[in-house]
Protein backbone atom coordinates (compact mmCIF):
# COMPACT_ATOMS: atom_id res chain seq x y z
CA UNK A 1 0.00 0.00 0.00
CA UNK A 2 1.71 3.22 -0.86
CA UNK A 3 2.55 5.59 2.15
CA UNK A 4 0.66 8.68 2.61
CA UNK A 5 2.96 10.45 4.75
CA UNK A 6 6.90 9.68 5.09
CA UNK A 7 9.83 10.39 7.60
CA UNK A 8 11.38 13.02 8.34
CA UNK A 9 14.03 14.06 5.92
CA UNK A 10 11.77 12.73 3.07
CA UNK A 11 8.95 13.52 0.59
CA UNK A 12 5.90 11.96 -0.87
CA UNK A 13 6.33 11.99 -5.19
CA UNK A 14 4.66 9.41 -7.05
CA UNK A 15 3.42 6.88 -4.06
CA UNK A 16 6.29 6.92 -2.65
CA UNK A 17 8.90 7.99 -0.35
CA UNK A 18 11.92 9.64 -1.41
CA UNK A 19 15.02 11.33 0.68
CA UNK A 20 15.34 15.32 0.56
CA UNK A 21 18.29 16.74 -0.74
CA UNK A 22 20.79 17.92 2.17
CA UNK A 23 22.07 21.15 2.51
CA UNK A 24 24.28 22.63 -0.36
CA UNK A 25 22.91 20.39 -2.84
CA UNK A 26 19.95 20.30 -5.21
CA UNK A 27 17.57 18.39 -6.37
CA UNK A 28 17.91 16.60 -9.96
CA UNK A 29 15.94 13.63 -10.14
CA UNK A 30 13.20 12.26 -7.79
CA UNK A 31 13.80 8.84 -6.57
CA UNK A 32 12.66 5.54 -8.55
CA UNK A 33 11.71 2.03 -7.50
CA UNK A 34 15.27 1.35 -8.28
CA UNK A 35 17.69 4.60 -6.87
CA UNK A 36 17.34 6.66 -4.42
CA UNK A 37 17.17 11.14 -4.64
CA UNK A 38 19.49 11.75 -6.95
CA UNK A 39 20.88 15.06 -5.81
CA UNK A 40 23.98 17.89 -7.02
CA UNK A 41 26.02 20.38 -5.55
CA UNK A 42 25.35 23.63 -5.45
CA UNK A 43 27.91 25.97 -7.61
CA UNK A 44 30.15 28.26 -5.85
CA UNK A 45 28.01 31.13 -5.90
CA UNK A 46 25.15 29.31 -4.83
CA UNK A 47 23.68 27.89 -1.37
CA UNK A 48 20.85 26.29 0.28
CA UNK A 49 20.76 25.79 3.50
CA UNK A 50 17.63 23.14 4.20
CA UNK A 51 16.79 19.54 3.32
CA UNK A 52 15.16 20.46 0.46
CA UNK A 53 13.81 19.15 -2.98
CA UNK A 54 14.46 22.50 -4.70
CA UNK A 55 15.69 22.60 -8.31
CA UNK A 56 17.87 25.46 -8.10
CA UNK A 57 20.36 26.69 -5.75
CA UNK A 58 19.67 30.22 -4.44
CA UNK A 59 22.38 32.82 -5.42
CA UNK A 60 24.61 34.11 -2.39
CA UNK A 61 23.88 37.64 -1.42
CA UNK A 62 25.79 40.28 -3.14
CA UNK A 63 27.67 42.76 -0.90
CA UNK A 64 27.21 45.88 -3.06
CA UNK A 65 29.99 48.37 -2.03
CA UNK A 66 27.71 51.16 -3.82
CA UNK A 67 25.01 50.94 -0.94
CA UNK A 68 27.78 50.87 1.57
CA UNK A 69 27.96 47.06 2.00
CA UNK A 70 30.61 44.26 2.49
CA UNK A 71 31.15 40.78 3.24
CA UNK A 72 30.95 39.91 6.36
CA UNK A 73 31.34 36.28 5.92
CA UNK A 74 31.53 34.54 2.53
CA UNK A 75 28.45 32.37 1.60
CA UNK A 76 29.04 28.34 1.13
CA UNK A 77 27.20 25.56 -0.44
CA UNK A 78 24.98 25.79 2.64
CA UNK A 79 25.10 29.06 3.98
CA UNK A 80 24.32 32.56 2.72
CA UNK A 81 26.81 35.35 2.43
CA UNK A 82 26.63 37.91 5.42
CA UNK A 83 26.66 41.84 4.64
CA UNK A 84 27.86 43.99 6.65
CA UNK A 85 28.04 48.10 6.44
CA UNK A 86 31.42 49.94 5.97
CA UNK A 87 32.71 52.05 9.23
CA UNK A 88 30.21 54.41 10.05
CA UNK A 89 27.17 52.96 8.51
CA UNK A 90 24.64 50.59 9.97
CA UNK A 91 22.36 48.15 7.91
CA UNK A 92 19.00 50.18 7.13
CA UNK A 93 17.16 46.66 7.71
CA UNK A 94 17.57 43.17 9.03
CA UNK A 95 18.15 41.89 5.66
CA UNK A 96 20.60 44.06 5.43
CA UNK A 97 20.33 45.52 1.53
CA UNK A 98 21.47 48.81 2.04
CA UNK A 99 23.20 51.09 4.37
CA UNK A 100 22.69 54.43 5.91
CA UNK A 101 25.28 56.67 8.35
CA UNK A 102 25.14 56.21 12.36
CA UNK A 103 22.72 59.11 13.71
CA UNK A 104 24.71 61.67 15.65
CA UNK A 105 23.21 62.22 19.29
CA UNK A 106 22.25 66.19 19.41
CA UNK A 107 23.35 68.68 22.08
CA UNK A 108 21.71 67.60 24.81
CA UNK A 109 21.76 64.15 24.48
CA UNK A 110 24.63 61.57 25.11
CA UNK A 111 25.83 58.07 23.07
CA UNK A 112 24.35 55.53 25.18
CA UNK A 113 25.32 52.26 22.41
CA UNK A 114 27.81 53.23 19.57
CA UNK A 115 26.81 51.95 16.53
CA UNK A 116 27.63 49.12 15.12
CA UNK A 117 27.54 47.50 11.22
CA UNK A 118 24.41 46.33 11.91
CA UNK A 119 22.58 48.94 14.41
CA UNK A 120 22.26 52.28 14.79
CA UNK A 121 23.64 54.77 17.20
CA UNK A 122 21.22 55.02 20.75
CA UNK A 123 20.76 58.06 22.46
CA UNK A 124 19.47 59.31 25.78
CA UNK A 125 18.93 62.77 27.13
CA UNK A 126 21.78 63.88 29.37
CA UNK A 127 20.47 63.67 32.99
CA UNK A 128 21.20 66.07 35.77
CA UNK A 129 24.55 66.29 36.38
CA UNK A 130 25.65 65.51 32.75
CA UNK A 131 25.73 67.89 29.48
CA UNK A 132 26.80 67.45 25.87
CA UNK A 133 27.20 70.79 23.82
CA UNK A 134 28.20 68.71 20.49
CA UNK A 135 26.14 67.00 17.86
CA UNK A 136 28.14 63.29 17.92
CA UNK A 137 28.13 59.30 17.06
CA UNK A 138 30.87 58.74 20.10
CA UNK A 139 30.24 60.92 22.88
CA UNK A 140 28.68 60.37 25.82
CA UNK A 141 27.18 63.00 28.39
CA UNK A 142 29.55 64.76 30.78
CA UNK A 143 29.87 65.11 33.91
CA UNK A 144 29.33 68.72 35.20
CA UNK A 145 32.36 70.21 36.23
CA UNK A 146 32.94 69.84 39.99
CA UNK A 147 33.78 73.59 41.46
CA UNK A 148 34.25 72.39 44.53
CA UNK A 149 36.90 70.24 44.07
CA UNK A 150 38.85 73.21 42.06
CA UNK A 151 37.86 75.67 45.15
CA UNK A 152 36.02 77.56 43.24
CA UNK A 153 31.99 78.26 43.39
CA UNK A 154 29.41 77.59 40.76
CA UNK A 155 28.35 80.98 39.09
CA UNK A 156 26.57 79.49 36.12
CA UNK A 157 24.40 76.40 36.74
CA UNK A 158 24.86 73.96 34.10
CA UNK A 159 22.07 72.28 31.50
CA UNK A 160 21.95 69.58 29.75
CA UNK A 161 23.57 71.27 26.93
CA UNK A 162 26.20 73.17 28.69
CA UNK A 163 28.31 72.91 31.80
CA UNK A 164 28.64 74.47 34.55
CA UNK A 165 30.62 78.27 35.27
CA UNK A 166 32.76 78.00 37.87
CA UNK A 167 33.98 81.68 39.66
CA UNK A 168 36.25 82.50 42.66
CA UNK A 169 35.00 81.90 46.24
CA UNK A 170 35.02 85.19 48.62
CA UNK A 171 38.49 84.93 49.82
CA UNK A 172 39.88 84.16 46.18
CA UNK A 173 37.66 87.04 45.41
CA UNK A 174 39.72 89.22 48.10
CA UNK A 175 42.98 88.39 46.49
CA UNK A 176 41.75 90.04 43.32
CA UNK A 177 40.38 93.12 45.70
CA UNK A 178 43.40 93.73 48.13
CA UNK A 179 45.74 94.65 45.34
CA UNK A 180 43.05 97.17 43.37
CA UNK A 181 42.00 98.79 46.83
CA UNK A 182 45.83 99.15 47.86
CA UNK A 183 46.85 100.21 44.11
CA UNK A 184 44.06 103.06 44.52
CA UNK A 185 45.45 103.88 48.05
CA UNK A 186 48.67 104.48 46.67
CA UNK A 187 48.08 106.67 44.24
CA UNK A 188 45.91 108.46 46.96
CA UNK A 189 48.51 108.95 48.98
CA UNK A 190 50.89 110.24 45.94
CA UNK A 191 48.76 112.89 45.05
CA UNK A 192 48.50 113.89 48.81
CA UNK A 193 52.38 114.22 48.89
CA UNK A 194 52.48 116.12 45.66
CA UNK A 195 50.23 118.70 47.21
CA UNK A 196 51.85 118.63 50.55
CA UNK A 197 55.17 119.63 49.28
CA UNK A 198 53.31 122.23 46.68
CA UNK A 199 52.05 123.82 50.00
CA UNK A 200 54.87 123.13 51.93
CA UNK A 201 57.27 125.23 49.13
CA UNK A 202 54.94 127.98 49.07
CA UNK A 203 56.80 130.95 51.67
CA UNK A 204 54.66 132.01 54.77
CA UNK A 205 55.15 135.47 54.65
CA UNK A 206 57.35 138.24 53.29
CA UNK A 207 59.98 137.95 56.28
CA UNK A 208 63.10 136.18 56.15
CA UNK A 209 63.77 132.88 57.74
CA UNK A 210 66.87 131.89 59.29
CA UNK A 211 68.43 129.27 56.92
CA UNK A 212 68.03 125.72 57.71
CA UNK A 213 69.70 122.56 56.20
CA UNK A 214 66.88 120.89 53.96
CA UNK A 215 65.75 118.00 56.35
CA UNK A 216 65.06 114.92 54.25
CA UNK A 217 61.26 114.00 55.26
CA UNK A 218 60.40 110.25 54.31
CA UNK A 219 56.75 110.39 54.53
CA UNK A 220 56.60 107.10 53.55
CA UNK A 221 57.71 105.99 57.03
CA UNK A 222 54.41 106.07 58.30
CA UNK A 223 52.74 104.16 55.55
CA UNK A 224 51.71 100.94 56.25
CA UNK A 225 53.50 98.04 54.65
CA UNK A 226 55.85 100.38 54.00
CA UNK A 227 58.68 98.58 56.46
CA UNK A 228 60.15 96.00 54.20
CA UNK A 229 60.52 92.91 57.32
CA UNK A 230 57.36 93.42 57.95
CA UNK A 231 54.51 90.96 56.24
CA UNK A 232 52.42 92.26 52.88
CA UNK A 233 49.44 92.95 53.97
CA UNK A 234 45.87 91.90 52.13
CA UNK A 235 42.73 93.35 52.20
CA UNK A 236 39.57 92.01 52.02
CA UNK A 237 36.78 93.71 49.58
CA UNK A 238 35.73 95.97 52.21
CA UNK A 239 39.86 97.71 52.06
CA UNK A 240 39.90 96.55 55.95
CA UNK A 241 43.90 95.32 56.18
CA UNK A 242 44.30 91.73 56.92
CA UNK A 243 47.83 90.17 57.52
CA UNK A 244 49.57 88.11 54.71
CA UNK A 245 49.93 84.11 55.55
CA UNK A 246 52.97 83.10 56.18
CA UNK A 247 54.23 80.75 53.47
CA UNK A 248 52.18 82.41 50.98
CA UNK A 249 52.73 84.84 48.03
CA UNK A 250 51.47 88.21 47.54
CA UNK A 251 50.30 87.67 44.55
CA UNK A 252 46.93 86.64 42.26
CA UNK A 253 46.02 82.93 42.23
CA UNK A 254 45.88 81.87 38.73
CA UNK A 255 42.93 79.30 37.98
CA UNK A 256 44.57 75.62 37.46
CA UNK A 257 44.06 74.22 33.73
CA UNK A 258 41.35 71.94 33.46
CA UNK B 1 6.27 0.98 -25.07
CA UNK B 2 9.76 1.29 -23.76
CA UNK B 3 12.73 -0.19 -25.91
CA UNK B 4 16.38 0.17 -24.87
CA UNK B 5 18.62 -1.05 -27.93
CA UNK B 6 22.29 -1.61 -27.83
CA UNK B 7 24.54 -1.53 -30.76
CA UNK B 8 28.37 -0.98 -31.14
CA UNK B 9 29.72 -4.91 -30.19
CA UNK B 10 31.75 -6.61 -32.12
CA UNK B 11 35.24 -8.42 -32.30
CA UNK B 12 38.31 -6.40 -31.19
CA UNK B 13 41.61 -7.18 -29.92
CA UNK B 14 43.19 -7.44 -26.39
CA UNK B 15 43.89 -3.85 -25.69
CA UNK B 16 41.35 -2.30 -27.84
CA UNK B 17 38.58 -0.31 -27.90
CA UNK B 18 34.53 -0.07 -28.58
CA UNK B 19 32.03 2.27 -27.90
CA UNK B 20 28.58 0.79 -26.95
CA UNK B 21 25.43 2.67 -27.63
CA UNK B 22 21.68 2.18 -26.14
CA UNK B 23 19.01 4.10 -27.48
CA UNK B 24 16.63 4.39 -25.54
CA UNK B 25 12.77 5.35 -26.15
CA UNK B 26 8.90 5.02 -23.95
CA UNK B 27 9.86 6.79 -20.57
CA UNK B 28 11.53 9.97 -19.69
CA UNK B 29 14.88 9.10 -19.61
CA UNK B 30 16.82 11.67 -17.94
CA UNK B 31 14.68 11.12 -14.87
CA UNK B 32 16.35 7.27 -14.86
CA UNK B 33 19.65 6.39 -13.38
CA UNK B 34 20.84 3.58 -16.44
CA UNK B 35 23.50 1.09 -15.92
CA UNK B 36 25.26 -1.22 -18.38
CA UNK B 37 25.44 -5.47 -16.77
CA UNK B 38 27.38 -8.24 -18.75
CA UNK B 39 26.52 -11.77 -18.84
CA UNK B 40 29.72 -14.29 -20.33
CA UNK B 41 28.45 -16.98 -21.83
CA UNK B 42 27.00 -19.39 -19.08
CA UNK B 43 28.00 -16.77 -16.56
CA UNK B 44 26.10 -15.15 -14.05
CA UNK B 45 25.11 -11.46 -14.82
CA UNK B 46 27.46 -8.66 -13.56
CA UNK B 47 27.24 -5.34 -13.25
CA UNK B 48 29.81 -3.28 -15.02
CA UNK B 49 28.28 0.72 -14.39
CA UNK B 50 25.85 3.03 -13.45
CA UNK B 51 25.32 6.37 -14.70
CA UNK B 52 22.49 8.65 -12.49
CA UNK B 53 20.05 10.67 -14.13
CA UNK B 54 21.58 13.78 -14.65
CA UNK B 55 25.10 12.26 -15.54
CA UNK B 56 26.59 13.97 -13.16
CA UNK B 57 27.38 10.53 -11.23
CA UNK B 58 28.87 7.26 -11.92
CA UNK B 59 30.02 4.50 -10.53
CA UNK B 60 31.86 1.50 -11.30
CA UNK B 61 33.00 -1.72 -9.86
CA UNK B 62 37.21 -2.33 -9.43
CA UNK B 63 37.62 -4.87 -11.81
CA UNK B 64 36.12 -1.85 -14.70
CA UNK B 65 36.98 1.28 -12.93
CA UNK B 66 40.06 3.34 -15.09
CA UNK B 67 39.02 1.24 -18.42
CA UNK B 68 35.10 1.56 -18.83
CA UNK B 69 33.33 4.84 -19.37
CA UNK B 70 29.83 5.16 -18.84
CA UNK B 71 28.09 8.42 -20.38
CA UNK B 72 24.83 9.22 -21.48
CA UNK B 73 22.94 12.37 -23.82
CA UNK B 74 19.83 13.04 -22.38
CA UNK B 75 19.06 15.24 -25.42
CA UNK B 76 18.98 12.04 -27.68
CA UNK B 77 17.81 9.68 -25.20
CA UNK B 78 21.35 7.68 -25.74
CA UNK B 79 23.42 6.02 -23.08
CA UNK B 80 27.13 4.97 -23.70
CA UNK B 81 29.99 3.09 -22.56
CA UNK B 82 33.01 3.22 -24.15
CA UNK B 83 35.23 0.09 -23.28
CA UNK B 84 39.09 0.53 -23.70
CA UNK B 85 42.04 -2.00 -22.78
CA UNK B 86 40.00 -4.67 -23.41
CA UNK B 87 40.61 -8.29 -22.07
CA UNK B 88 40.02 -12.04 -22.89
CA UNK B 89 37.45 -11.68 -19.60
CA UNK B 90 35.75 -8.76 -20.81
CA UNK B 91 33.83 -10.88 -23.63
CA UNK B 92 30.26 -11.05 -23.16
CA UNK B 93 26.67 -10.19 -23.83
CA UNK B 94 26.49 -6.59 -22.88
CA UNK B 95 22.70 -5.42 -21.51
CA UNK B 96 21.61 -2.03 -21.37
CA UNK B 97 18.97 -1.32 -18.34
CA UNK B 98 16.84 0.85 -16.11
CA UNK B 99 16.46 -2.03 -14.17
CA UNK B 100 12.77 -2.07 -14.97
CA UNK B 101 13.44 -2.54 -18.86
CA UNK B 102 16.46 -4.06 -20.52
CA UNK B 103 17.84 -4.29 -23.91
CA UNK B 104 18.22 -7.08 -25.79
CA UNK B 105 22.44 -7.30 -25.21
CA UNK B 106 24.91 -6.51 -27.42
CA UNK B 107 28.02 -9.04 -27.81
CA UNK B 108 31.36 -7.87 -27.22
CA UNK B 109 34.32 -10.25 -28.25
CA UNK B 110 37.66 -10.27 -27.18
CA UNK B 111 40.23 -12.15 -29.07
CA UNK B 112 43.79 -12.03 -30.72
CA UNK C 1 28.62 -7.46 -0.95
CA UNK C 2 28.43 -10.99 -1.80
CA UNK C 3 24.64 -12.36 -2.99
CA UNK C 4 24.40 -15.91 -2.58
CA UNK C 5 21.34 -18.05 -3.62
CA UNK C 6 20.11 -21.02 -2.62
CA UNK C 7 19.27 -23.60 -3.80
CA UNK C 8 23.14 -22.94 -5.98
CA UNK C 9 22.14 -24.18 -9.14
CA UNK C 10 18.65 -25.95 -9.53
CA UNK C 11 14.90 -26.04 -8.26
CA UNK C 12 13.15 -28.84 -9.99
CA UNK C 13 9.51 -28.47 -9.34
CA UNK C 14 6.24 -30.12 -10.80
CA UNK C 15 3.74 -27.40 -12.59
CA UNK C 16 1.33 -26.36 -9.86
CA UNK C 17 3.45 -26.66 -6.94
CA UNK C 18 5.15 -24.02 -5.10
CA UNK C 19 8.59 -22.73 -5.58
CA UNK C 20 11.27 -20.80 -3.02
CA UNK C 21 13.99 -19.01 -3.72
CA UNK C 22 16.56 -17.78 -0.88
CA UNK C 23 19.00 -15.00 -1.03
CA UNK C 24 21.25 -13.88 1.61
CA UNK C 25 23.53 -10.86 1.50
CA UNK C 26 27.20 -10.84 3.16
CA UNK C 27 25.85 -7.83 5.24
CA UNK C 28 22.75 -5.74 5.78
CA UNK C 29 21.58 -4.01 2.47
CA UNK C 30 19.17 -1.35 4.34
CA UNK C 31 19.62 2.02 4.28
CA UNK C 32 19.72 4.57 6.83
CA UNK C 33 16.04 6.08 5.53
CA UNK C 34 14.95 2.41 5.17
CA UNK C 35 15.38 1.33 1.88
CA UNK C 36 16.17 -1.81 0.37
CA UNK C 37 17.13 -2.16 -2.71
CA UNK C 38 16.76 -5.97 -3.43
CA UNK C 39 15.26 -7.02 -6.79
CA UNK C 40 14.16 -10.42 -8.11
CA UNK C 41 15.16 -11.14 -11.94
CA UNK C 42 13.98 -14.06 -14.34
CA UNK C 43 16.13 -14.73 -17.19
CA UNK C 44 14.11 -17.11 -19.65
CA UNK C 45 16.41 -19.16 -21.98
CA UNK C 46 17.93 -17.17 -24.88
CA UNK C 47 16.30 -13.72 -23.26
CA UNK C 48 17.60 -10.99 -21.60
CA UNK C 49 16.75 -10.48 -17.54
CA UNK C 50 13.08 -9.13 -16.79
CA UNK C 51 12.52 -7.53 -13.09
CA UNK C 52 10.20 -9.29 -11.04
CA UNK C 53 10.67 -7.93 -7.70
CA UNK C 54 11.85 -4.45 -6.35
CA UNK C 55 12.67 -2.88 -3.25
CA UNK C 56 11.99 -6.88 -1.67
CA UNK C 57 8.12 -7.19 -1.94
CA UNK C 58 6.89 -4.59 -4.80
CA UNK C 59 5.71 -6.77 -7.54
CA UNK C 60 6.49 -4.94 -11.24
CA UNK C 61 4.28 -4.02 -13.28
CA UNK C 62 2.44 -6.77 -15.45
CA UNK C 63 3.81 -9.40 -12.73
CA UNK C 64 1.55 -12.13 -11.76
CA UNK C 65 0.34 -11.88 -8.47
CA UNK C 66 1.96 -15.59 -7.76
CA UNK C 67 5.15 -14.34 -7.37
CA UNK C 68 5.70 -12.71 -4.22
CA UNK C 69 9.33 -10.86 -2.07
CA UNK C 70 9.81 -11.05 1.41
CA UNK C 71 12.67 -10.72 3.79
CA UNK C 72 14.74 -7.85 5.37
CA UNK C 73 18.72 -6.92 6.37
CA UNK C 74 20.52 -9.90 4.82
CA UNK C 75 18.10 -12.57 4.66
CA UNK C 76 15.36 -12.58 1.45
CA UNK C 77 12.89 -14.69 -0.33
CA UNK C 78 11.22 -15.41 -3.45
CA UNK C 79 7.92 -17.70 -3.75
CA UNK C 80 5.87 -18.92 -6.92
CA UNK C 81 2.80 -19.97 -5.42
CA UNK C 82 1.94 -22.39 -8.56
CA UNK C 83 4.58 -22.67 -11.25
CA UNK C 84 3.67 -22.34 -14.52
CA UNK C 85 5.30 -23.31 -17.78
CA UNK C 86 6.32 -19.56 -18.76
CA UNK C 87 7.90 -19.41 -14.94
CA UNK C 88 10.78 -21.74 -16.07
CA UNK C 89 14.58 -19.83 -16.15
CA UNK C 90 17.03 -18.52 -14.57
CA UNK C 91 16.54 -16.49 -11.34
CA UNK C 92 18.77 -13.67 -10.05
CA UNK C 93 18.31 -11.45 -6.44
CA UNK C 94 20.60 -8.76 -7.36
CA UNK C 95 21.05 -5.66 -4.63
CA UNK C 96 21.36 -2.20 -6.16
CA UNK C 97 21.61 -0.67 -2.75
CA UNK C 98 25.41 -0.63 -2.40
CA UNK C 99 28.15 -0.07 -4.85
CA UNK C 100 29.27 -2.18 -6.26
CA UNK C 101 25.95 -3.64 -7.46
CA UNK C 102 25.57 -7.16 -7.04
CA UNK C 103 23.82 -10.14 -8.33
CA UNK C 104 22.91 -13.67 -7.11
CA UNK C 105 24.80 -16.91 -8.48
CA UNK C 106 21.81 -18.09 -10.21
CA UNK C 107 18.62 -20.02 -9.16
CA UNK C 108 17.49 -22.22 -12.55
CA UNK C 109 13.42 -23.47 -11.93
CA UNK C 110 13.07 -26.69 -13.48
CA UNK C 111 10.40 -29.50 -14.44
CA UNK C 112 11.49 -32.15 -12.26
Known amino acids: EPPTACREKQYLINSQCCSLCQPGQKLVSDCTEFTETECLPCSESEFLDTWNRETRCHQHKYCDPNLGLRVQQKGTSETDTICTCEEGLHCMSESCESCVPHRSCLPGFGVKQIATGVSDTICEPCPVGFFSNVSSAFEKCRPWTSCETKDLVVQQAGTNKTDVVCGPQDRQRALVVIPICLGILFVILLLVLVFIKKVAKKPNDKAPHPKQEPQEINFLDDLPGSNPAAPVQETLHGCQPVTQEDGKESRISVQERQ | QVKLEESGGGLVKPGGSLKLSCAAS????????MSWVRQSPGERLEWVAE????????YYPDTVTGRFTISRDNANNTLYLEVSSLRSEDTAMYYC?????WGQGTLVTVSA | IVMTQSPTLSLPVSLGDQASISCRSSQSIVLTNGNTYLEWYLQRPGQSPKLLIY???NRFSGVPDRFSGSGSGTDFTLKISRVEAEDLGVYYCFQGSHVPYTFGGGTKLEIK
Open chain 2, 97 to 101: TSRAY
Open chain 2, 26 to 33: GFTFRNYA
Open chain 2, 51 to 58: VSGSGYYT
Open chain 3, 55 to 57: KVS
